[in-house]
């Protein structure tokens, strides 16, 4: 008789999840010499230990503590790029501007990027059928708690000028309910962070509006200012040209506004 299994509303664990995490860890530590000391088997053991045999709606930040500790790394605190709803461009940017880092350029972010995972209470099985959806099922699920935990630590580590890339095509350019709006903004440390600089990325070819005047950006400015951090904002009217100019800053067309 097949055992009854909880049906969740979200997709199940990414196939070959253990192998993927382990392979990503090995690849990352090979590419980044400063992380060569990391034992990827231990990293996987800590990752697994955070959610295996636990109810997938009852995960806490503490469950991820061993993983956070084993995966801690040195990132230049003044070279941090946060993003909200515009991950691909942010990653394209840091692939070119190699001295800047998104969360997914760190070991822990790289391991989990685009993956889903969950277990089941009291069994050592990984649930490949379904996992809790943040809205429909519960917020304290393994994936959401992981990203909340690593995002908080990443923001806490930031210093000097912190950059954030925001999607100007969204109805809410700054969304208080995003990971950036609900976690990272509130964990920037005013004693270390001088300025948050927002880059608002325009979607339309002919869009010449000043999206820095958008009400949600003003809301972000208000939140940041109340935390004693300065705020600045730039429109990126042509993201394609922006990337091109990051690659080739000497190009004559790169002196004009992008």
């Amino acid at each position: 008789v097949p055992r009854w299994r909880q049906q969740w509303s979200g997709p199940g664990t990414t196939k070959r999840f253990p192998e993927t995490v382990l392979a990503r860890c090995v690849k990352y530590t090979e590419i980044h010499p400063e992380m060569r000391h990391v034992d990827c088997q231990s990293v996987w053991d800590a990752f697994k230990g955070a959610f295996i045999s636990k109810h997938p709606c009852n995960i806490t930040e503490e469950d991820y503590q061993p993983l956070m500790k084993l995966g801690t790394q040195t990132v230049p605190c003044n070279k941090i790029l946060l993003w909200s709803r515009i991950k691909d461009l942010a990653h394209q940017f840091t692939q070119v501007q190699r001295d800047m880092f998104t969360l997914e350029d760190t070991l822990l972010g790289y391991l989990a990027d685009d993956l889903t995972w969950c277990g089941e209470f009291n069994t050592s099985k990984i649930n490949y059928q379904s996992c809790p959806d943040w809205r429909k099922d519960c917020s304290n699920n393994p994936v959401s708690v992981f990203w909340k935990t690593v995002s908080r630590r990443f923001a806490e580590a930031a210093c000097d000028v912190v950059h954030v890339m925001l999607n100007g095509s969204r109805s809410k350019i700054f969304d208080k309910n995003s990971t950036f709006g609900s976690v990272e903004v509130h964990n920037l440390q005013p004693e270390k962070v001088q300025t948050l600089e927002a880059w608002v990325i325009h979607g339309g070819r002919e869009d010449s509006r000043d999206l820095c005047q958008d009400p949600t950006i003003k809301e972000l400015e208000s939140i940041i200012s109340k935390r004693n951090i300065q705020f600045s904002c730039k429109n990126i009217y042509r993201p394609d040209k922006f990337l091109q100019c990051v690659k080739n800053p000497e190009d004559s067309s790169c002196t004009s506004e992008i």
């Epitope: 400063e34 992380m35 000391h37 034992d39 231990s42 053991d45 800590a46 230990g49 503490e62 503590q65 061993p66 500790k69 084993l70 801690t72 790394q73 040195t74 990132v75 605190c77 630590r153 806490e156 580590a157």
Partner: antibody, heavy 117, light 107 residues
Amino acid sequence: QVQLVQSGAEVKKPGSSVKVSCKASGYTFTNHWIEWVRQAPGQGLEWMGDIFPGGGYTDYNEKFKGRVTITADESTSTAYMELSSLRSEDTAVYYCARGRDLAMDYWGQGTLVTVSS
Amino acid sequence: DIQMTQSPSSLSASVGDRVTITCGASQNINVWLGWYQQKPGKAPKLLIYKASNLHTGVPSRFSGSGSGTDFTLTISSLQPEDFATYYCQQGQSYPYTFGQGTKVEIK
């Protein structure tokens, strides 16, 4: 080889502060956690807190929160543990150790701190 | 805080004996357990990390086992230099906590 060398013994008055140093060598200082543990005379081991020198991450035992500050100087590969508002119960040997797989693989020789009026 | 309970608190044994020390955690700590040896007036030394991994330079007569809440340190054939106090330590959650120690004495 990995070595952690701590500062010398200290005698302190109640209410004062002590700062113990721990100089690391033989490995990349910024890549490993440094743990601080103390041991009162004839007693067991008690974890106080730790630091990841490369990112300045710190975690403290709630029991010592507000009284202990752990810092690190990357330029000299030295970690520091400062304990304030000292009382007689703080008389102990204070150890630093390097973190490895959530255990502590190499230890300093220990620093005896005596709190006495 | 996670409580770590070692037993026995002390034991007397002879050279060549097989010695077993147990350590229990008040909640699941997965494999995040270390074992240390400490001699009077000296700093502790790591013997075993991650419940069963032998630290560099530690003789193979020392072994560790267990996961979850129950762990064991075994010395297969006690040597004169093994008379010391042994501590277990959990690294699953803050604050890290140690067992109260097991003193191994000469019979």
